[in-house]
C-alpha cells in the first residue's frame, strides 16, 4: 500500500504520500484555530507507471495506453486514497469549541 | 460540474474531462475484444487552481496552501469523478460472451 508506513520509510520516486506540515496561521491565514498550531496534512505526488496502485479499470486502461503510447499526455495521477480527520479547538465568543474536521490528513495515495 | 456537457463545449484550460478515443487492438493490444473496436475512455487533465471543484477538505486546504505558497509543489490533481461502464463482446472458444466492464468511461473530473 502507498501509505505513510511504506512511503515515509522508502525513497520512492513513483506515486506515494509525502510529508507536508501546514501551520494554520502562517500557511493558511486561519488565525482563529487555537489548537493545534499546525498539523501534517501530507500530499500525494510521483509518476503513475502502468499498474501502480491503479484505482479503477479506467486507470489501468490509461496506464496501459500510456505505456504503449509514450507520447500521450493522458496518464493517471497520484491522489489521496485514505484520509483521516483532525480535531481542532477554537473559540466562539468565550466558548471553546472542539470540532472534528473530516478528510484533513492524507494517509495513503492511489493512481486515479 | 466538470463533466462532458460542459468540458466538451468549452475551451477550458483548467481541470476538465477531455475526449480520448482508445482502439482496443492498436492502443491496448487487446485483440480479444470483438465489439466495440474502440471507445471514448476520455481522461482528466488541466491545472487545479484554488477552489476548482475541490473534492475534500484536504484538497481545499492544499489549494489554499498552494495559493499562499506559490513555490510549493504540493497541489491537487485533476482526476476522474464519475465513471460509467462499457459493454463488450468477446469469444470464449466459439461462444460469444457479453460483459459489462465497470469504470471504463470518464464522465466528469474533480480536483483531489
Amino acid at each position: 500500500a502507498l501509505d505513510t508506513n511504506y512511503c515515509f520509510r522508502n525513497l520512492e520516486e513513483n506515486c506515494c504520500v509525502r510529508p507536508l506540515y501546514i501551520d494554520f496561521r502562517q500557511d493558511l491565514g486561519w488565525k482563529w484555530v487555537h489548537e493545534p498550531k499546525g498539523y501534517y496534512a501530507n500530499f500525494c505526488s510521483g509518476p503513475c507507471p502502468y499498474l501502480r496502485s491503479a484505482d479503477t479499470t479506467h486507470s489501468t486502461v490509461l496506464g496501459l495506453y500510456n505505456t504503449l503510447n509514450p507520447e500521450a499526455s493522458a496518464s493517471p495521477c497520484c491522489v489521496p486514497q485514505d484520509l483521516e480527520p483532525l480535531t481542532i479547538l477554537y473559540y466562539v465568543g468565550r466558548t471553546p469549541k472542539v470540532e472534528q474536521l473530516s478528510n484533513m490528513v492524507v494517509k495513503s495515495c492511489k493512481c486515479s | 460540474a466538470l463533466d462532458t456537457n460542459y468540458c466538451f463545449r468549452n475551451l477550458e484550460e483548467n481541470c476538465c474531462v477531455r475526449p480520448l478515443y482508445i482502439d482496443f487492438r492498436q492502443d491496448l493490444g487487446w485483440k480479444w475484444v470483438h465489439e466495440p473496436k474502440g471507445y471514448y475512455a476520455n481522461f482528466c487533465s488541466g491545472p487545479c487552481p484554488y477552489l476548482r471543484s475541490a473534492d475534500t477538505t484536504h484538497s481545499t486546504v492544499l489549494g489554499l496552501y498552494n495559493t499562499l505558497n506559490p513555490e510549493a509543489s504540493a497541489s491537487p490533481c485533476c482526476v476522474p469523478q464519475d465513471l460509467e461502464p462499457l459493454t463488450i463482446l468477446y469469444y470464449v472458444g466459439r461462444t460469444p460472451k457479453v460483459e459489462q466492464l465497470s469504470n471504463m468511461v470518464v464522465k466528469s473530473c474533480k480536483c483531489s
Epitope: 493558511l28 486561519w30 482563529w32 466562539v92 465568543g93 468565550r94 | 484554488y50 481545499t60 486546504v61 489554499l64
Partner: antibody, heavy 119, light 112 residues
Framework: QVQLQQPGAELVKPGASVKMSCKAS????????ITWVKQRPGQGLEWIGD????????NYNEKFKTKASLTVDTSSSTANMQLSSLTSEDSAVYSC????????????WGQGTSVTVSS | DVVMTQTPLSLPVSLGDQASISCRSS???????????LHWYLQKPGQSPKLLIY???NRFSGVPDRFSGSGSGTDFTLKISRVEAEDLGVYFC?????????FGSGTKLEIK
C-alpha cells in the same frame, strides 16, 4: 477589491422558505468566515450565525437555529442562507459579511437582501 | 444575551466639532485571552455598514485618524475629533466576546 454580492429583494409567502445567496470576490474565500446579520427598521442588527467555507464549520445564534441554515459552495465562492417557515417577523434586510474568525470584527459587508413575507 | 446600550440615540453636531458616542455592555467584554472584542461601525443611508474600529481601539485600514476608540470592561467611547460631512450616519457598537454576538441600537450623527 473585496465584494459580497447579494440579490436585492425576495418576496415570499408565509410558511414558505427562501434561499438567498452571497457571492464573494476579490479575496481568498476559504480564508475568511462568512457571517449573516438581520436588520429590521427600528429593531437594530441581529447576528444569525457564521460559516467557514474552508471546512464548512458553522456557529448559530440559538434564536435562529431552527430558522436559518447556512451553507457554502466553494467552487463558486458563494455562501447561502435558507430561512424556513417564514412569518411577517422574518421580513427584514439580511446581510452577509466576512471576518477573519468567529470573534473577529466584520470588515466587509454585502448590500443585503430585502425579504418581504406577504400573502 | 449581552445588551449593548448606546447613548445618545441622536447626536446633532456642527462640522468641525468633536463628537463622542458612548456604548455600555451588560457584561465585561474582556476575553480570557485578554482581548476586548468591541467594534464600531458607521452605516450611511442606503449603504451597508463600514468598519471603523476593531478590538476596542484599532483603526481599520483607510479610516482617518480623527476616529478613535477607547474604554475598558463595560464602558466604551468612540470619538471623532473634527466632524466632517462624510461622517454623518448611524454609528453602531458591536461585541464578539460573548455568544450570541450583539449590536448596539445605533447613534445617529446629524448636522445641528
Amino acid at each position: 477589491q473585496v465584494q459580497l454580492q447579494q440579490p436585492g429583494a425576495e418576496l415570499v409567502k408565509p410558511g414558505a422558505s427562501v434561499k438567498m445567496s452571497c457571492k464573494a470576490s476579490g479575496y481568498i474565500f476559504t480564508s475568511y468566515w462568512i457571517t449573516w446579520v438581520k436588520q429590521r427598521p427600528g429593531q437594530g442588527l441581529e447576528w444569525i450565525g457564521d460559516i467557514f467555507p474552508g471546512t464548512g464549520s458553522t456557529n448559530y445564534n440559538e434564536k435562529f437555529k431552527t430558522k436559518a441554515s447556512l451553507t457554502v459552495d466553494t467552487s463558486s465562492s458563494t455562501a447561502n442562507m435558507q430561512l424556513s417557515s417564514l412569518t411577517s417577523e422574518d421580513s427584514a434586510v439580511y446581510s452577509c459579511a466576512r471576518k477573519l474568525g468567529p470573534n473577529y470584527a466584520v470588515d466587509y459587508w454585502g448590500q443585503g437582501t430585502s425579504v418581504t413575507v406577504s400573502s | 444575551d449581552v445588551v449593548m446600550t448606546q447613548t445618545p440615540l441622536s447626536l446633532p453636531v456642527s462640522l468641525g466639532d468633536q463628537a463622542s458616542i458612548s456604548c455600555r455592555s451588560s457584561q465585561s467584554l474582556i476575553h480570557s485571552h485578554g482581548n476586548t472584542y468591541l467594534h464600531w461601525y458607521l452605516q450611511k443611508p442606503g449603504q451597508s455598514p463600514k468598519l471603523l474600529i476593531y478590538k476596542l481601539s484599532n483603526r481599520f485600514s483607510g479610516v482617518p485618524d480623527r476616529f478613535s476608540g477607547s474604554g475598558s470592561g463595560t464602558d466604551f467611547t468612540l470619538k471623532i475629533s473634527r466632524v466632517e460631512a462624510e461622517d454623518l450616519g448611524v454609528y453602531f457598537c458591536s461585541q464578539s466576546t460573548h455568544v450570541p454576538f450583539t449590536f448596539g441600537s445605533g447613534t445617529k450623527l446629524e448636522i445641528k
